[in-house]
């Protein structure tokens, strides 16, 4: 006879249910958003539900299919490209990831006009990168590491470079290190407004030391990868930026831009480039010791069809406390005169601003101040700045939108977003179409996320675009974990904190505590957005309060706390994280026997270092992908916070803040330690040499490696990676399965 | 395979204007991969580029001629032209009219060249 | 604009003997350079491109070599029919320009 509970009739409470681990796998609380994809002042294209792409007028309230599904289908298409004449779209499909932002695959063009695939100089497969031009209908493409350009779909290609090699020479996208840590796209290309030039970055990785790892697959003998990668303190890609005139192609070679003397006399990267009008470019450089950064506007010298860059027209960024900018140099937003432009960078009090500069970066007029952070600029039309930033209410994890009036004096600003949803949507973000005529918000929480279209004059919502009802009502009876965002102040330092506790949460018991941590310079965790993922499940059904804390070195609170981690990576940040532990004990329903930590990638360097702390706060913990020593990370990041692992420089520190010196003090603490043999970002190595430092210290610890996985740890073995960590945690809480 | 042929008169007076035809033969002056372009060679001398022509009809001028020169294509009769006004003893040369490939491949088509004397 | 200098002028050899032409740039024209012969009365020939690559049917006696300033024609056995005038022309930079030439002479 088995006995079953009676349910109460009615009761709220009985017909809801916790959240399950399998909710959080199968993505049955995901949301959607909508980002129009904009192709004119009023217009926008959407891939519909079943796959036709619909090309919307805000202003007549028609819609009509450009391009059916059917089409798509023929090619297995995943993805499009209106030409900006519209005269034909190109479709992407066999897609292959290479790395964060990088894959390549087959394009087909297809003519709008005639309703047939474009025969005849087809392109070659795959291809790396395809862009139209932003005017008419070129193509510029990347295929096997060289550029070509088709003046019309169907015309041969000219080519451009020559001299692309796998691995060696890259011309118009990144190298490894450029894509990850620098440009943070697939591509580096850019046409001028018109269409008129094509600038290139050309990455020589000749020189560079190559980090080579088994990919096993189901061959009898594994693959080796092999790909360029600067570590910290390695011969770094040379980059040299060309420009193409792409009405008379290929006839005298690319022009090289020259780089400003300053930034030339040592080595340097190239940070961005931006075109400010057809016979205008504005690039920015960076000093390899990142706290230099040189912002040079070029301009085309028609007699020689040369590039020339005055001394008088660089700008040079310095920081005097850590590196130039946030996670990168920010990128200049010009304004109508084509020569003055708005800038994110410091203040005089340590917080980032927006800046207009019209003649020198001295005499920088501010336009936003106080103590929090302008976080970017979206767009600057005659009489209006767009920009986000976390002023409101003095909530650093928030994101809202406002408006400043440049066009009248004093300009006056306007918070768009502020008041719209204030208790759904408090952090946002926006797209623009053609000078700001409409644009669209989307809200990403914390409340459930919603998509919304505006008057860019105005401002009025003209309508929501998407507002997850399936996922509100799927939501109904879930027993979903409470959030609340706090600080906590110590020492003069605030630590902003969100907790999250499970659904019945009363103040008088006692939980487990787990702490999820990233901790990375110009992070930010502790951000008000929506989220039902894995330690949402955590708290509604095994009864964790989980706290994500932004420390020292995180972003957004200004330059003190931001730069105080400059050249000492892996102090204050563990430090933060203990103080706000202690603190979370302090509150009186935390079992301080049953503390865990855990993180992935940077957050899986600072749980080792919380666990290895030797402060016997943590029971347990949990550490993905982690990075153990900073000798075996990227150049272009780890220098940027620690400057050269040389002894006249900071070697020192990169030897004190290794995992691996600190291998005893993992003797106290239940350690799992997690990572796919094909990262190629942190790499196996990291783990290889913190297993063989525990091993060698007699030190017992789990482990668990996936074969052939990158450092996202994705597909199947997500599935199987959250439910070995369930199992660890529960294990380590005495939680019973 | 292709073939440049030159054509025009052989003696043009100080002051006028020197016209020359390229008629292209075994391909298309409309191939988005070539350019079109003339080079002279004064008497007992070197090698000069004058200037040239893309399909779309975008020209390209050697600046120390700039002033006087027009290069147009006829897509139609699978020609392109030169003229350089307000001649003068010194641009008497051999003019050959090329297929220029860009600046990777170079002009690998040459015309045989025609004989142009400025003299009155 | 740039000035692309040849040297010898005058290269005096026998047939069977190896030459030697040379080009230098007034600035760094990268591999952007070509070679050409031509023969009296006759249009020049494409004999290189991008400093180093033989054009379609030229003879393996022919090779490129040199890049940014300073680059280098040879002739590995001279045939007869190799007596004639050599150009190199530059286009890495506006506008294209040619050197001199060098003759190669019977001796």
């Known amino acids: 006879i088995v006995l079953r509970p009676s349910r109460v009739h009615n009761s709220e409470e009985n017909t809801m249910r916790a959240l399950t681990l399998k909710d959080i796998l199968n993505g049955t609380f995901s949301y959607k958003t909508f980002f129009p994809n904009w192709i004119s002042g009023q217009e926008y294209l959407h891939q519909s539900a079943d796959n036709n792409i619909v090309l919307y007028n805000i202003e007549t309230g028609q819609s009509y299919t450009i391009l059916s599904n059917r089409t798509m289908k023929s090619v297995n298409a995943s993805n499009y490209g209106l030409s900006p004449d519209r005269q034909f779209v190109y479709l992407e499909s066999d897609y292959s990831k290479l790395w964060r932002y990088s894959y390549t695959a087959t394009y087909y063009i297809y003519d709008l006009s005639n309703g047939e695939f474009v025969r005849g100089n087809e392109l070659p497969r795959p291809i790396q990168y395809l862009c139209w031009s932003p005017v008419g209908s070129k193509l510029a493409y990347v295929y096997q590491n060289n550029i070509y350009l088709k003046q019309r779909p169907g015309d041969p290609p000219f080519q451009i470079t020559f001299n692309g090699r796998e691995n060696k020479i890259f011309n118009g996208i990144p190298d490894w290190v450029y894509e990850e840590e620098m440009l943070a796209t697939k591509y580096a290309l850019w046409w001028s407004p018109n269409g008129k030039f094509l600038a290139y970055a050309e990455f020589n990785d000749t020189d560079i030391p190559v980090i080579a790892y088994s990919y096993y697959g189901d061959e009898q003998y594994p693959r080796t990868i092999n790909i360029p990668y600067p570590k910290a303190g390695a011969k770094n890609p040379v980059v040299r930026i060309f420009i193409i005139d792409t009405t008379y192609p290929a006839y005298v070679g690319p022009q090289e831009v020259p780089v400003p003397a300053m930034i030339a006399s040592s080595d340097y990267y190239f940070s961005w480039l931006t075109w400010v009008t057809d016979e205008r470019v504005c690039l920015q450089w960076l000093k390899r010791v990142q706290n230099v950064s040189v912002l040079s506007i070029c301009d085309f010298r028609e007699d020689w069809q040369t590039w020339d860059c005055p001394k008088t027209q660089e700008h040079i960024e310095e920081s005097r406390t850590g590196w130039a900018g946030g996670f990168f140099v920010s990128t200049p937003v010009f304004s109508y005169d084509a020569i003055s432009y708005y800038k994110i960078f410091s203040d005089k009090d340590g917080y980032k601003h927006i800046h207009y500069i019209k003649d020198t970066v001295e005499n920088a007029i501010q336009i936003t101040s106080g103590k929090w952070e302008a976080i970017n600029i979206f767009r600057v039309t005659q009489d209006s700045l767009f920009y986000s930033s976390n002023e409101f209410e003095e909530y650093p994890g928030r994101r809202n939108i406002y408006r400043i009036s440049i066009g009248s004096y004093p300009p006056s600003k306007k918070c768009v977003t502020c008041h719209l949803r204030k208790e759904r949507c408090q952090y946002y973000t926006a797209s623009f179409s053609d000078y700001a005529k409409y644009y669209a918000l989307v809200c990403y929480g914390p409340g459930i996320p919603i998509s919304t279209l505006h008057d860019g004059r105005t401002d009025q919502e003209i309508k929501i675009l998407e507002e997850n009802k399936e996922l509100e009502n799927a939501l109904k009876n879930i027993q979903l974990p409470k959030e609340e965002i706090k600080k906590l102040e110590v020492d003069e330092i605030t630590l902003w904190y969100k907790m999250i506790l499970p659904p019945q949460f009363d103040r008088s018991k006692k939980y487990p505590l787990l702490i999820q941590v990233y901790g990375g310079p110009c992070s930010q965790s502790v951000r008000s957005v929506f989220a039902v993922n894995w330690i949402s499940y955590l708290a509604s059904k095994e009864g964790m309060v989980i706290a994500l804390v932004d420390g020292r070195g995180t972003a957004f609170q200004g330059d003190k706390l931001l730069y105080a981690v400059y050249r000492k990576l892996g102090v204050y940040e563990v430090e933060d994280q203990i103080t706000a532990v202690r603190k979370f004990i302090e509150m009186g329903f935390i079992d301080e026997k049953r503390i865990a930590i855990w993180g992935w990638s940077y957050g899986g360097y600072v749980s080792s270092l919380a666990l290895a702390s030797g402060t016997g706060l943590f029971k347990c913990g949990i550490a993905v992908a982690p990075v153990s020593s900073w000798e075996y990370y990227a150049s272009v990041y780890t220098e940027r916070f620690m400057g050269l692992p040389t002894k006249d420089d900071n070697l020192e520190h990169y030897k004190n803040s290794t995992v691996m010196a600190r291998a005893e003090y993992f003797r106290n603490v239940d350690y799992l330690l997690i990572h796919g043999t094909a990262d190629d970002n942190v790499h196996f190595q990291n783990s290889a040499q913190i297993a063989k430092a525990l091993v060698n210290a007699q030190v017992d610890f789990q482990a668990m490696w996936y074969s052939d996985q990158n450092h996202g740890l994705s597909g199947l073995s997500t599935n199987h990676l959250y439910t070995h960590m369930t199992h660890f945690l529960k294990q380590c809480f005495s939680l019973s399965d | 395979q292709l073939q440049l042929q030159e054509s025009g008169p052989g003696l043009v007076k100080p002051s006028e204007t020197l016209s020359l035809t390229c008629t292209v033969s075994?391909?298309?002056?409309?191939?988005?991969?070539?350019?079109w372009g003339w080079i002279r060679q004064p008497p007992g001398k070197g090698l000069e580029w004058i200037g040239s022509i893309y399909y779309s009809g975008s020209t390209n001028y050697n600046p120390s001629l700039k002033s006087r020169v027009t290069i147009s294509v006829d897509t139609s009769k699978n020609q392109f032209s030169l003229k350089l006004r307000s001649v003068t003893a010194a641009d008497t040369a051999v003019y050959y009219c090329?297929?220029?490939?860009?600046?990777?491949?170079?002009?690998?088509?040459w015309g045989q060249g025609t004989t142009v004397t400025v003299s009155s | 604009e740039i000035v692309l200098t040849q040297s010898p002028a005058t290269l005096s050899l026998s047939p069977g003997e190896r030459a030697t032409l040379s080009c230098r740039a007034s600035?760094?024209?990268?591999?952007?350079l070509a070679w050409y012969q031509q023969k009296p009365g006759q249009a020049p020939r494409l004999l290189i491109y991008d400093a180093s690559n033989r054009a379609t049917g030229i003879p393996a006696r022919f090779s490129g070599s040199g890049s940014g300033t300073d680059f280098t024609l040879t002739i590995s056995s001279l045939e007869p029919e190799d007596f004639a005038v050599y150009y190199c022309?530059?286009?890495?930079?506006?506008?294209?320009?040619f050197g001199q030439g060098t003759k190669v002479e019977i001796k």
């Open positions: 075994g391909g298309s002056i409309s191939s988005s991969s070539s350019y």
């Open positions: 022309q530059q286009r890495s930079n506006w506008p294209p320009t």
């Open positions: 600035q760094s024209v990268s591999s952007y």
């Open positions: 090329v297929r220029d490939k860009g600046y990777y491949y170079g002009m690998d088509v």
